[in-house]
């Protein structure tokens, strides 16, 4: 694929300020492109702050795509763990505070708050109920605590992140996972089933992170969240692989799973919900 192809691709992503990342393309969403090949590639996920695997279609897409995990880390995670710890200690804003408000593509019209980097204040906006980005808070206070500066130029409160000793990944402290498991998959797999805001009754599956299994639920046809899959297989492919089972205090063993050579759909890009 050529640079020209990337340049021609119409993307819908907002970008983080270049100074916050080694390269601005590290902030692009994984883009599998308009083709249908099944190629294992890696991208930098700004929300988990890790390089992660995705399936690339083989053409176009964008520059946040690497042949190997090492190449991705080299391009996008220079001293990443250290930088994040330092960020928390120095009370700088998390990168997502600089994302533009994004209501997503649904029609829920829920009142939420986002940090407006132009005005340097948290402001109200209408969230559609699905997709969007992490610059999205349920309360004004939460937004201020995480993104606004205090009177001394520091944040009002720390954004609590903990360094995971297993693979130097960062997970929000609020993530509730049974102690028997550690989760290293997409963050939406940890969210509860959400049937959404409409009146349909569509058969869908969600990942139940408490029991570590994909379970059916009835989806209303719009809204909801990204923990929403059209088949059990798709659900398992996206979420099951993220769990590592702890068999003793020291040892880690990956849960067994058969890998099917099928397109892995990236939930936040593939769930296309709207009333027609």
């Amino acid at each position: 694929d050529s640079e020209e192809d990337e340049e021609h691709t119409i993307i819908t992503d907002t970008e983080l300020p270049p100074l916050k990342l080694m390269h601005s393309f590290c902030a692009f969403k994984a883009d599998d492109g308009p083709c249908k090949a099944i190629m294992k590639r890696f991208f930098f996920n700004i929300f988990t702050r890790q390089c992660e695997e995705f399936i690339y279609g083989g053409c176009e897409g964008n520059q946040n795509r690497f042949e190997s995990l090492e190449e991705c880390k080299k391009m996008c995670t220079r001293d990443n763990a250290n930088r994040i710890i330092k960020t928390t200690l120095q009370q700088e804003k998390p990168d997502f505070c600089f994302l533009e408000e994004d209501p997503g593509i649904c029609r829920g019209y829920i009142t939420r708050y986002f940090y407006n980097n132009q005005t340097k204040q948290c402001e109200r906006f209408k969230y559609g109920g699905c997709l969007g980005n992490m610059n999205n808070f349920e309360t004004l206070e939460e937004c201020k605590n995480i993104c606004e500066d205090g009177p001394n130029g520091f944040q009002v409160d720390n954004y609590g992140t903990q360094l995971n000793a297993v693979n130097n990944s960062l997970t929000p402290q609020s993530t509730k996972v049974p102690s028997l498991f550690e989760f290293h998959g997409p963050s939406w797999c940890l969210t509860p089933a959400d049937r959404g805001l409409c009146r349909a009754n569509e058969n869908r599956f969600y990942y139940n992170s408490v029991i570590g299994k994909c379970r059916p639920f009835k989806y209303s046809g719009c809204g909801g969240n990204e923990n929403n899959f059209t088949s059990k297989q798709e659900c398992l492919r996206a979420c099951k692989k993220g769990f590592i089972q702890r068999i003793s205090k020291g040892g880690l063993i990956k849960t067994k799973r058969k890998r099917k050579k099928q397109r892995v759909k990236i939930a936040y890009e593939e769930i296309f919900v709207k009333n027609m």
Epitope: E4, D5, E7, H8, T9, I10, I11, T12, D13, T14, E15, G33, P34, C35, K36, A37, G57, G58, C59, E60, E100, E101, D102, P103, I105, R107, G128, E269, E270, F272, K274
Partner: antibody, heavy 117, light 107 residues
């Protein structure tokens, strides 16, 4: 809810100019790529032009390159199509459409442009 | 330029299955998307990425894409499905449309 409303169409003589507008609401306009697609009377859909939302890149079909210009005003949530040196074959209904990934998920109702002497 | 070829018209009786094809050299590699357009209205996406149905689109609409041909299938066709249908793909940053197929529901 997402709404796209086109305006600015009308009757114009060959060689003349026209500016179409597309007023967008119900979504964060500035982060989406947008396109113009046209449909001549009794004919099929023809892509005209696209832009890339938060970036400045613009793209045109060969049939309009050098004559049409796509632009946007994010503060007004509006997409524009400046059409110069109009020809009879430009007569069509012009639709504004939002690009989601690699397809068009929302369309306006269209505005009719007639090029005739 | 890149061509997506559709039959100009397809006829079907109510309750029967309608199949509309779209052929193009790059379809084995690229996704196809389908739009329905009723007279005097804007197009509406009915299938995206070969076989995905947006919410609000009836289950009788389905799609497939194999070889050089993408197919839109409407099972149990209803009178309200009478419309023009267009396939669309994306090649080197440019969207391309098929010529369109007029679906007539007989009777």
């Amino acid at each position: 809810q997402v709404q796209l409303v086109e305006s600015g169409g009308g009757l114009v003589q060959p060689g003349g100019s026209l500016r179409l507008s597309c007023a967008a609401s119900g979504f964060t306009f500035r982060v989406y790529g947008m396109s113009w697609v046209r449909q001549a009377p009794g004919k099929g859909l023809e892509w005209v032009s696209s832009d890339r939302g938060s970036r400045s890149s613009t793209y045109y079909a060969d049939s309009v390159k050098g004559r049409f210009t796509i632009s946007r005003d994010n503060s007004k949530n509006t997409l524009y199509l400046q059409m110069n040196s109009l020809r009879a074959e430009d007569t069509a209904v012009y639709y504004c459409a939002r690009v989601y990934r690699y397809w068009f998920d929302y369309w306006g109702q269209g505005t009719l442009v007639t090029v005739s002497s | 330029s890149y061509e997506l070829t559709q039959p100009p018209s397809v006829s079907v009786s109510p309750g029967q299955t309608a199949r509309i094809t779209c052929s193009g050299d790059n379809l084995p590699k690229y996704y196809a998307h389908w739009y329905q357009q009723k007279p005097g209205q804007a197009p509406v996406v009915v299938i995206f990425r070969d076989s995905n149905r947006p919410s609000g689109i009836p289950e009788r609409f389905s799609g497939s894409n194999s070889g050089n041909t993408a197919t839109l299938t409407i099972s149990g066709t209803q009178a309200m499905d009478e419309a023009d249908y267009y396939c669309q793909s994306w090649l080197s940053g440019t969207p391309w449309f098929g010529g369109g197929t007029k679906l007539t529901v007989l009777g």
